[in-house]
């Protein structure tokens, strides 16, 4: 049997049953999430659930730039350090950079400091690039 790999929307990339869109647009976290949702297919800001997934994403992004942080779908909606993925994925894999989680920083970004392999918390109203994800 021939198994066809699902296709992603133009400009999105495929990895292990998911499509990812890296948007070089400056948006705050909530606007970024709304923009991801606007593409349909159940798209949200991306959850990153393994080192392999993180490495694939990081390699892709590094082909565009190496200095700008990027919003992902991890947030702390209750502002009580109870982090969760906006797409409902289980929060098991963690890759925090070890920076302070204090202050009014309740949204997560991929940090450029470690080639996008680690995360930092940041203020949700910051306007930055963002990564969307959906399952085709």
């Amino acid at each position: 049997d021939i198994i066809m790999r699902p296709s992603c929307a133009p400009g999105w990339f495929y990895h292990k049953s998911n499509c990812y869109g890296y948007f070089r647009k400056l948006r705050n976290w909530s606007d970024a999430e709304l923009e991801c949702q606007s593409y349909g297919n159940g798209a949200h800001l991306a959850s990153i659930l393994s080192l392999k997934e993180a490495s694939t994403i990081a390699e892709y992004i590094s082909g565009y730039q190496r200095s700008q942080p990027i919003w992902i779908g991890l947030h702390d909606p209750q502002k009580r350090q109870q982090w969760q993925w906006i797409d409902g994925a289980m929060y098991l894999y963690r890759s925090w950079s070890g920076k302070s989680m204090g202050g009014n920083k309740h949204c997560a970004e991929m940090s450029s400091n470690n080639n996008f392999l680690t995360w930092s918390s940041n203020e949700c109203n910051k306007r930055q690039h963002f990564l969307c994800k959906y399952r085709p």
Partner: antibody
């Protein structure tokens, strides 16, 4: 207040050379990428070239690659465009533009008044 | 021919709302921010809108930007005579690895 002042334009024959300068003030020049953008008479805008704040990275439109060279002297707060092998289609007003709010060098925050380059025999 | 497509002209009477479209593709507007520039007659261009809908200080809120998919638009509400100018959209193009402009739209106030 950001100020950009171009100079060096003029009339030149096809195949000739010209060097444009852009004197910058009102911001920390070395911190920001700079670009040259041109506009042929009665036409739209066309990006020509860009340079990083340090001067270590340069970028060119295909239409000028190999003929134009962008450079900067951060000690003099000045941007340059060396134009060689000029063609009639290079005739345009040349603007220098700064990015003073973003790390993307295609975001032209402030513009100079422009300098006219005419390539004609 | 420009990578981004704009209508060559648009017009309206004072007080009206005028919208200018800018059409691109997934290699430019689809994944990159859109900027709008205003060029008054005989003057250098001026940044009007950045990052889709942000206005630099000094730009009236009559000007607004929006974006959807691979298209963007600039709206001028409460049109005034001093808005008569050329308007250009711009973004980055991933395929060309270069900034690109639309061909420009001349707005006339009737």
């Amino acid at each position: 207040e950001v100020q950009l002042l171009e100079s060096g334009g003029g009339l030149v024959q096809p195949g000739g050379s010209l060097r444009l300068s852009c004197a910058a003030s009102g911001f920390t020049f070395s911190s920001y990428a700079m670009s040259w953008v041109r506009q042929a008479p009665g036409k739209g805008l066309e990006w020509v070239s860009a340079i990083s704040g340090s001067g270590g990275s340069t970028y060119y439109a295909d239409s000028v690659k190999g003929r134009f060279t962008i450079s900067r002297d951060n000690s003099k707060n000045t941007l340059y465009l060396q134009m060689n092998s000029l063609r009639a289609e290079d005739t345009a007003v040349y603007y220098c533009a700064s990015d003073s709010d973003s790390s993307d060098y295609y975001y032209f925050d402030s513009w100079g008044q422009g300098t006219m380059v005419t390539v004609s025999s | 021919q420009s990578v981004l497509t704009q209508p060559p002209s648009a017009s309206g009477t004072p007080g009206q709302r005028v919208t200018i479209s800018c059409s691109g593709s997934s290699s430019n507007i689809g994944f990159n921010d859109v900027y709008w520039y205003q060029q008054l007659p005989g003057l250098a261009p001026k940044l009007l809108i950045y990052s889709n809908n942000q206005r630099p200080s000094g730009v009236p809120d009559r000007f607004s930007g929006s974006e959807s998919g691979t298209s963007a638009s600039l709206a001028i509400s409460g049109l005034r005579s001093e808005d008569e100018a050329d308007y250009y959209c711009a973004t980055w193009d991933d395929s060309l690895s270069a900034p690109v402009f639309g061909g420009g739209t001349k707005v006339t106030v009737l």
